[in-house]
């Protein structure tokens, strides 16, 4: 299962950590995809490492752990964020976070 804070808030110009937690007795995480609505933010592969989408490379920092640190937030960053955990064996698990960026 995926456990996450469903709603988080942060100040404009500040930063926020996007974090999902996956727990399973049998499946191992092999990849985690992070998306802002339908737009790819970053991917973490246990074997291949991190890929951060070029459009976000100046504002998205991998970590901590399998999460992301989203920096220099703007009001336009308000919205839904999704983590997708790919596991082996087991399948796909999704989590949702709503980020509200507030005026500073």
């Amino acid at each position: 299962t995926i456990d996450t804070k469903r709603n988080i808030s942060a100040e404009e110009g500040g930063s926020v950590i996007l974090q999902c937690h996956f727990s399973s007795d049998t499946a191992e995480v092999t990849q985690v995809d992070w998306k802002q609505q339908d737009q790819l933010l970053a991917i973490y592969s246990v074997d291949l490492g991190w890929h951060v989408a070029s459009v976000f490379s100046d504002r998205v920092v991998p970590g901590p752990s399998l999460g992301l640190t989203f920096q220099s937030l703007t009001m336009n960053d308000t919205g839904e964020y999704f983590c997708t955990y790919h596991t082996y064996p087991g399948g796909i698990y999704k989590g949702r976070i709503f980020l509200k960026v507030q005026e500073s």
Epitope: V46, L48, G49, H51, A53, H86
Partner: antibody, heavy 125, light 107 residues
Framework: QVQLQESGPGLVKPSETLSLTCTVS??????????LAWIRQPPGKGLEWIGS???????YYNPSLESRVTISVDTSKNQFSLKLSSVTAADTAVYYC?????????????????WGQGTMVTVSS | EIVMTQSPATLSVSPGERATLSCRAS??????LAWYQQKPGQAPRLLIY???TRATGIPARFSGSGSGTEFTLTISSLQSEDFAVYYC?????????FGGGTKVEIK
């Protein structure tokens, strides 16, 4: 540019073990950030993924073949290999080695970017 | 595992015409889909990754679209060298799975 070449016997007897090797040239497995994969194609049929291995030794297998498959890597020889035990006529196929995820860091996708030419293996007594 | 289904099995098209190939996943794969072209006696070649991005050296007449469970490969104007078998494939998750293929033949 990385290139792949499969090698091994073209004929294997039923119940024996099929053994194939893929030699990687133009790049070092030990420093490469990609998966090394085996895929097969029975005559006149489609593609079937057999399994993949990362340089660290992490392996992932097709569940339908898992009990019979072993994939290993020899970084010193820049090779990886496939062993498929207890073969039957249904294992007759062209066997391809491939590299998967070579462009992950740059482009964020995992696909079979580079393929060997393939080697035909017939299972028959 | 995710089952990939391609249709049609065979597509008869005249040179210069448009070809539209379909691929359906049994569950959502987001945009984690690749297309390959295979000619007789040759290894497959990567055409499209990420559902819509052309691989290096692939002509602009090849385009991919779709996300989730429904995907399409379009060849805008078929050339003689395009008559081949086309496969879709999802990745990730494990296990990697291919569709059964669509053969594009000369009408």
């Amino acid at each position: 540019q990385v290139q792949l070449q499969e090698s091994g016997p073209g004929l294997v007897k039923p119940s024996e073990t099929l053994s194939l090797t893929c030699t990687v040239s133009g790049g070092s497995i030990s420093s490469g950030s990609y998966y090394l994969a085996w895929i097969r194609q029975p005559p006149g049929k489609g593609l079937e993924w057999i399994g993949s291995i990362f340089r660290s030794g992490s392996t992932y297998y097709n569940p339908s073949l898992e009990s019979r498959v072993t994939i290993s890597v020899d970084t010193s020889k820049n090779q990886f290999s496939l062993k498929l035990s207890s073969v039957t006529a249904a294992d007759t196929a062209v066997y391809y080695c491939a590299i998967e995820g070579a462009n992950f860091k740059d482009f964020g996708y995992v696909a079979f970017d580079i393929w060997g030419q393939g080697t035909m293996v017939t299972v028959s007594s | 595992e995710i089952v990939m289904t391609q249709s049609p099995a065979t597509l008869s098209v005249s040179p210069g015409e448009r070809a539209t190939l379909s691929c359906r996943a049994s569950q959502s794969v987001s945009s984690n889909l690749a297309w390959y072209q295979q000619k007789p006696g040759q290894a497959p070649r990567l055409l499209i990754y990420g559902a819509s991005t052309r691989a290096t050296g692939i002509p602009a007449r090849f385009s991919g679209s779709g996300s989730g469970t429904e995907f399409t490969l379009t060849i805008s104007s078929l050339q003689s060298e395009d008559f081949a078998v086309y496969y879709c494939q999802q990745s990730p998750p494990w296990p990697r799975t291919f569709g059964g293929g669509t053969k594009v033949e000369i009408k």
